[in-house]
Amino acid sequence: SPSPVTPSPTLKELIEELVNITQNQASLCNGSMVWSVNLTAGMYCAALESLINVSDCSAIQRTQRMLKALCSQKPAAGQISSERSRDTKIEVIQLVKNLLTYVRGVYRHGNFR
């Protein structure tokens, strides 16, 4: 029988994955540094814009793919360039933890934009 249309990852699934990769972790991706981003400017695409530059790190590939799927479903998502702090670099683990905190807040308040 024909396969169903692919469901995008849910906010809950993203949270579960972010928890999974950050728990009991002091570092991720060998301490790789990424640009800090303003998550209020379209959190999925903003986070992806920074994290997409991380390679050779299997730990965050699932997160990258989830963000890509969520960013892809936004209207004209590829056109939006998120606000990025070009003078501030932080560790991958810090960005992921920031994203987790932000996404949890969005989830709690039911604002799934």
Partner: antibody, heavy 119, light 107 residues
Framework: EVQLVQSGAEVKKPGASVKVSCKTS????????MYWVRQAPGAGLEWMGY????????SYNQNFKGRVTLTADKSTSTAYMELSSLRAGDIAVYYC????????????WGQGTLVTVSS | DIVLTQTPLSLSVSPGETASISCKAS??????VAWFRQKPGQSPQALIY???NRYTGVPDRFSGSGSGTDFTLRISRVEAEDTGDYFC?????????FGAGTKVELK
Amino acid sequence: EVQLVQSGAEVKKPGASVKVSCKTSGYTFIDYPMYWVRQAPGAGLEWMGYIDPYNGATSYNQNFKGRVTLTADKSTSTAYMELSSLRAGDIAVYYCATAVVATDVMENWGQGTLVTVSS
Amino acid sequence: DIVLTQTPLSLSVSPGETASISCKASQNVRNAVAWFRQKPGQSPQALIYLASNRYTGVPDRFSGSGSGTDFTLRISRVEAEDTGDYFCLQHWNYPLTFGAGTKVELK
């Protein structure tokens, strides 16, 4: 060494289904998704979708309008691609591939499986 | 879907010269472009990811550049083994999409 070995060439009738397998070795199967890409004769590459063997999550190219089903068998480290309602436009070489270094950039490819649709 | 337009469709280069292939995206894909080479009867081989990063084992004669919508693959000091079809891929957005390809031949 990462190896992806695909099943042999298939000849199918219009309207039938085909199931191509991709047996993997040399890496941990559940660590990376399996991508499927096809190439019609003398044409370019077309991404069909991927499956994450870790949790069964899939992403499909909607151009295939639900005709593609991707599955993975963790016990044998084998991925499968099934394409239904075959037509002449589906004649192509079908590839499985994995992306290890960069997310969604397929650097390890199977040898390809030619699927022919003929009445 | 993001459309990738590759130019030229074919390219004839003398050994030792430089070949340049362009890939233009229909929308901003940041630096998420990869390049592949495919020889007749073979599977594609990944050369470059994230616009400018070479895979292990790929000669430094291959270089990628660009961001946003305009990307270029350069092959300097072209050798006989560089012939084949070259494809770009955008890996910013789903569905992943490829350019139509550029055939590189030796003069």
